[in-house]
């Protein structure tokens, strides 16, 4: 069984190489009883969803940028 069906994770795998300009918003889900791993779920400007690798330096920068833009709004 995949991680997603073994726990209640939403990310079966992570998408590599996404351009920040294609991202509308990012949600970071902390680990919990439903899922043992941190999940980074991006909503793309085309409405689709993508799971990103939380350990990736690029993803960390995207999250930081999104959080900072939220604070300034």
């Amino acid at each position: 069984a995949s991680v997603a069906t073994e726990l209640r994770c939403q990310c079966l795998q992570t998408l590599q190489g996404i351009h920040p300009k294609n991202i509308q918003s990012v949600n970071v889900k902390s680990p919990g009883p439903h899922c043992a791993q941190t999940e980074v779920i991006a909503t793309l400007k085309n409405g689709r969803k993508a799971c990103l690798n939380p350990a990736s330096p690029i993803v960390k920068k995207i999250i930081e940028k999104m959080l900072n833009s939220d604070k300034s709004n």
Partner: antibody, heavy 125, light 107 residues
């Protein structure tokens, strides 16, 4: 056709036990999480329990934890709910539901997209 | 546990009306919210998944919106078959929780 069929409901005395079954057909049962949801007479929906595709992970509402056990037999395409130490407040129609929802290759959502017809459980002396 | 609060609890409307049902979560749940319709004596039916996506086979007069803590189900041009009870449900974390329901009745 995707179908879920519950059985095993009935009248039981307080403190008694009952085992509900849910027979699944029309989809690859072992790939999907399943849930039990109940509805007391004239009341809203209450989630009871969920189980992962392999059966390795289980989840319970606090109201049933320690009394109810969810399990599945993937070789028989069947979901179970063992209910012990039943109380009057457990009286309800019990539904099993499939949790479908692979949207993208890398993103999964958990929506109860297929439901059984429900089986009534009455706890009364 | 995440509490889900629906409003109103009941609603009277006429065929052809546009109605809105709201659902509020006690904490942010992103868009991890579904809407169900239930008719008396029947099992619930999935209408909207992930806050705004129409389930296959559901008429386009149903729509959902919202993110975070506030969500809305809208039915445009009510049809006789739409009179039912509607529930929201979060799956952001376990335990899964439903709203208390909104009963839509014919005026």
């Amino acid at each position: 056709e995707v179908q879920l069929l519950e059985s095993g409901g009935g009248l039981v005395q307080p403190g008694g036990s009952l085992r509900l079954s849910c027979a699944a057909s029309g989809f690859t049962f072992s790939e999907l999480s399943m849930s039990w949801v109940r509805q007391a007479p004239g009341k809203g929906l209450e989630w009871v329990s969920a189980i992962s595709g392999s059966g390795g992970s289980t989840y319970y509402a606090s109201s049933v934890k320690g009394r109810f056990t969810i399990s599945r037999d993937n070789s028989k395409n069947t979901l179970y709910l063992q209910m012990n130490s039943l109380r009057a407040e457990d009286t309800a129609v019990y539904y099993c539901a499939r949790e479908g929802g692979r949207l993208e290759p890398y993103y999964y959502y958990y929506a109860m997209d297929v439901w059984g017809q429900g089986t009534p459980v009455t706890v009364s002396s | 546990d995440i509490q889900m609060t629906q409003s109103p609890s009941s609603l009277s409307a006429s065929v052809g009306d546009r109605v809105t049902i709201t659902c509020r979560a006690s904490q942010s749940i992103s868009d991890n919210l579904h809407w169900y319709q239930q008719k008396p004596g029947k099992a619930p039916k999935l209408l909207i998944y992930d806050a705004s996506n129409l389930e296959s086979g559901v008429p386009s007069r149903f729509s959902g919106s919202g993110s975070g803590t506030d969500f809305t189900l809208t039915i445009n041009s009510l049809q006789p078959e739409d009179f039912a009870t509607y529930y929201c449900q979060q799956y952001y974390s376990t335990p899964l929780t439903f709203g208390q329901g909104t009963k839509l009745e014919i005026k």
